[in-house]
Interface confidence: low
């Protein structure tokens, strides 16, 4: 499955939307900062391509959950967040035609299951420190920057399968 | 007032070992992102090793890989750098210097610097 | 690893001039580039985190730009205090690597 080049370019509109978003000084937020163990391992190199999908799928779906809440409406500009949403829903349905091509559906389902499962509790760990820290910007600011880092590294790893096609 | 202060200056023969200390104020280390960066004499920077937020991921350079570990006491708020198996090129000041950014994969910029200490690995 | 490559490694300037000092990544780092001014016998200081946000308390002639491979840090008009020595890291990956550095001394 060739994934297109628009969905490339809207990984890098993503980024750029995120970084829009920020309100505040992460240097002014030192005390909420949180090692919240993203699993760079599950998006490493070694993976085939059938591998990845279902894995960047669910990282993209869990962002998306992660900013449709009411309480992250509340947090963001809303024109931005309308802009984030479209480019995600973009990205989730190219995914979704690779996996409706076959692609991601038949190799090792145990690998991916168990990288999904890391994906989804690291998006937990994002959930449960929003609520410890009753949603204040600072929290917000630091999940902002969290999931530009780790949503960059996601982006590199479906760049580097372009790359080896 | 946000502070980062490195344990005196050492000198060390090839072979030996060193514990460098740094001791943080107005900021806990246990909740930010750590790093060690040293400058040998007239040279420029070099990344040498970090611990996240957690404590529960380390890295190291390849240079370091095997001799040198990054540990802290969050009792003490201490950040600490034990360095075994000392050799000439070792011989620098080391900084231990605090992140901006959040967790154990992101950070975007060394923003809290110690004074530096100088070892120097000599016979 | 990742390369980080500066250039021009020295550079002669004047107060009040335009100055423009390059990092080039040996393979994409998105954004995570940043930027320090070192003056000797000091611990160096951040200017810029994230390739173009300005650190608290740097003054507003510093600026960065650039993604991926290429980025530059601009000194809009040199001041005397300007006089240092840059660089650049990335933090996208570990090991976090500098640049060799780009001495900047008065003409």
């Known amino acids: 499955c060739d994934l297109p080049q628009t969905h490339s370019l809207g990984s890098r509109r993503t980024l750029m939307l995120l970084a829009q978003m920020r309100r505040i000084s992460l240097f002014s937020c030192l005390k909420d900062r949180h090692d919240f163990g993203f699993p760079q391992e599950e998006f490493g190199n070694q993976f085939q391509k059938a591998e990845t999908i279902p894995v960047l799928h669910e990282m993209i779906q869990q962002i998306f959950n992660l900013f449709s809440t009411k309480d992250s409406s509340a947090a963001w500009d809303e024109t931005l967040l309308d802009k984030f949403y479209t480019e995600l829903y973009q990205q989730l349905n190219d995914l979704e035609a690779c996996v409706i091509q076959g692609v991601g559906v038949t190799e090792t389902p145990l690998m991916k299951e168990d990288s999904i499962l890391a994906v989804r509790k690291y998006f937990q760990r994002i959930t449960l420190y929003l609520k410890e820290k009753k949603y204040s910007p600072c929290a917000w600011e630091v999940v902002r920057a969290e999931i530009m880092r780790s949503f960059s590294l996601s982006t590199n790893l479906q760049e580097s399968l372009r790359s080896k096609e | 007032e946000v502070q980062l202060l490195e344990s005196g200056a050492e000198v060390k023969k090839p072979g030996g070992s060193l514990r460098l200390s740094c001791a943080a104020s107005?900021?806990?280390?246990?909740?930010?992102?750590m790093s060690w960066v040293r400058q040998a004499p007239g040279k420029g920077l070099e990344w040498v090793s970090a611990i996240s937020g957690s404590g529960g991921s380390t890295y190291y350079a390849d240079f370091v890989k095997g001799r040198f570990t990054i540990s802290r006491d969050n009792s003490k708020n201490t950040l600490y750098l034990q360095m075994n198996s000392l050799r000439a090129e070792d011989t620098a000041v080391y900084y231990c210097?605090?992140?901006?950014?959040?967790?154990?994969?992101?950070?975007?910029?060394?923003?809290?610097w110690g004074q530096g200490t100088l070892v120097t690995v000599s016979s | 690893d990742i390369q980080m490559t500066q250039s021009p490694s020295s550079l002669s300037a004047s107060v009040g001039d335009r100055v423009t000092i390059t990092c080039r990544a040996s393979q994409g780092v998105g954004n995570f580039l940043a930027w320090y001014q070192q003056k000797p016998g000091k611990a160096p200081k951040l200017l810029i985190y994230?390739?173009?946000t300005l650190q608290s308390g740097v003054p507003s002639r510093f600026s960065g730009s650039g993604s991926g491979t290429d980025f530059t840090l601009t000194i809009s008009s040199l001041q005397p205090e300007d006089f240092a020595t840059y660089y650049c890291q990335q933090s996208y990956s570990t090991p976090f690597t500098f640049g060799g550095g780009t001495k900047l001394e008065i003409k």
């Open positions: 994230g390739a173009s």
């Open positions: 107005g900021f806990t280390v246990s909740s930010n992102y």
């Open positions: 210097v605090s992140s901006v950014g959040a967790g154990a994969y992101y950070y975007q910029g060394l923003d809290v």
